[in-house]
């Protein structure tokens, strides 16, 4: 109840001189607090900026290709706890991009030892039409890549509730959510706990029995009556995502070699690629079986390396 606001009448008293002295002291205190507040706000802003910058440094955006999955078998759970969650894990390895500059080429051999041999010889004379071109073979300096496991758990006991209206105090809203989600008429069931966050207007409802969450999730919305107004809150599966075995790796490619020194060539890239391929196929040139050649004579190209 509103701190007895309606229960007691406030009596106004005449001010004594002592009270005015107190007022002056209070005014000074308020000014001091206000200054401190401004100072703290500035500090918070500064720290928030630093935090944002730090966060950006540790963010990785990767376009992960779509993967086709093969369904192998049905597992018979040993106990009920295995039924309370659906879990799956994905191994994610990022491809490492490398920019091939103008006048450069990348050549990938089938065997590592061939690549190593080409690099150790360093200088190679390649016949390109009527020009005998000296190219330099170097290891490919790669940026770091990442490898990690994404572990996803979809709960069969919990649900997420969003778009909860901010119409009640926190304790009352918790009660109201539990009450509403326990109604079997709407597919609900006995509620174990409610974790409600008023600020975000969301909650996590944990049920006592398996299967209740599934029933509720058959619909995307759920009715919540507050003072005769029916609010429709949004329900969605509760998932927990963990990042595991996060590894950052770097190094040089074992089968791919960087060729430089072709800046002056004005020819079709595909023709040059064929000529490089022919040259490095020959054992007498220190080469061997070639997998692929990618050449850049105009615009730089991006090549992606994977494990």
């Amino acid at each position: 109840m509103e701190a007895d606001k309606d229960d007691t009448q406030q009596i106004l008293k005449e001010h004594s001189p002592d009270e005015f002295i107190k007022d002056e002291q209070n005014k000074g205190l308020i000014d001091e607090i206000t200054k401190k507040n401004i100072q703290l706000k500035k500090e918070i802003q500064k720290l928030e900026t630093e935090l944002q910058e730090a966060t950006k440094e540790f963010q990785i955006k990767e376009d992960i290709p779509e993967t086709k999955m093969k369904f192998l078998s049905v597992e018979t759970p040993e106990n009920d706890s295995q039924l309370s969650n659906i879990s799956c894990s994905f191994q994610v390895s990022s491809k490492v991009p490398y920019e091939i500059q103008k006048g450069q080429a990348l050549i990938t051999f089938e065997k590592e030892e061939v690549a190593q041999n080409v690099v150790s010889m360093s200088k190679h004379h390649v016949q390109i039409k009527d020009v005998n071109l000296e190219v330099t073979a170097k290891p490919v300096p790669l940026n770091s890549g990442v490898r990690f496991q994404v572990y996803v758990e979809v709960s069969k006991m919990k649900i997420n509730v969003t778009e909860i209206p901010d119409t009640l105090r926190e304790d009352q809203m918790r009660d109201k959510l539990e009450l509403s989600f326990s109604k079997s008429r709407n597919g609900g069931g006995e509620v174990d706990r409610v974790d409600y966050d008023r600020q975000s207007g969301s909650a996590v409802i944990t049920f006592v029995e398996i299967g209740v969450a599934d029933k509720i999730l058959k619909k995307k919305e759920y009715p919540l009556y507050i003072n005769q107004t029916c609010h429709r809150v949004t329900v969605s599966p509760y998932t927990e995502i963990h990042l595991k075995k996060y590894q950052i790796f770097s190094g040089t490619s074992k089968r791919t070699v960087l060729l430089t020194g072709m800046e002056g060539i004005q020819m079709d890239e595909e023709i040059v690629e064929d000529l490089i391929n022919i040259h490095f196929q020959r054992a007498k040139n220190g080469g061997g079986e070639v997998d692929v050649v990618k050449c850049s004579l105009g615009q730089p190209h991006i090549a992606y390396f994977e494990e």
């Epitope: 009660d175 109201k176 009450l179 109604k183 006995e190 003072n227």
Partner: antibody, heavy 124, light 112 residues
């Protein structure tokens, strides 16, 4: 389904007393608030406090009862009311009541189950 | 605080007659109003919830109506057994205060 209050007694002013409400035929669930209501001799009904019977166990008090009265859920079938610094004005029959949610299509409530009451007399 | 004001404090009517009891809330209670009947030495009995919904087992002679802050209980075809004290009550969820609960002062119905 029934409720029964116990613990009513004749006590001196300033004393403390704990009343217990025991439910039979049902156990507390998310659809109820368990409450205490009192009635002074020859007077009307006066709400004291409620506790949510669901998992949160939220408590709500009448403004005059805050600080002196404490409602608690001690099991899935019992609720207590602790009263301190009792005065003659607290002399009354104390009822335990179940406030039920009729919220099939609205936010409706009603005390649909009452105990017979227990008498508390504060006198020197 | 939620305050329920009930009028009149006492009313008398003959058997077969009709009585009307009024209840005014200090704020909008969104039809979340209940009516109770109490006989001496007994606990109250719920008659109506949600302003107009009859609790099971309660005769249809009891009729509740109203909205917002004004509510009415009408008892028609009065019977001797209807002699009792009647109370209105409401509980209200709130965004700024505790969940409040309040009873009206009661109306004594005398059947002649």
């Amino acid at each position: 389904q029934s409720l029964e209050e116990s613990g009513g007694d004749l006590v001196k002013p300033g004393a403390s007393l704990t009343l217990t409400c025991t439910a039979s035929g049902f156990s507390f669930s998310s659809s109820y608030y368990m409450c205490w209501v009192r009635q002074a001799p020859g007077k009307g009904l006066e709400w004291i406090a409620c506790i949510y019977a669901g998992s949160s166990g939220s408590t709500y008090y009448a403004s005059w009862a805050k600080g002196r009265f404490t409602i608690s859920k001690t099991s899935s079938t019992t609720v207590t009311l602790q009263m301190t610094s009792l005065t003659a004005a607290d002399t009354a029959t104390y009822f335990c009541a179940r406030e039920y949610s009729y919220d099939d299509y609205g936010d409706f409530w009603g005390f649909n189950l009452w105990g017979p009451g227990t008498l508390v007399t504060v006198s020197s | 605080a939620l305050v329920m004001t009930q009028t009149p404090s006492s009313v008398s009517a003959a058997v077969g007659g009709t009585v009307t009891i009024n209840c005014q809330a200090s704020q909008n209670i969104y039809t979340n109003l209940a009516w109770y009947q109490q006989k001496p030495g007994q606990p109250p009995k719920l008659l109506i919830y949600g302003a107009s919904n009859l609790e099971s087992g309660v005769p249809s002679r009891f009729k509740g109506s109203g909205s917002g802050t004004e509510y009415t209980l009408t008892i028609s075809d009065l019977e001797c057994d209807d002699a009792a004290t009647y109370y209105c009550q409401s509980s209200l969820y709130s965004r700024i205060a505790d969940r409040a609960n309040a009873f009206g002062g009661g109306t004594e119905v005398v059947v002649k």
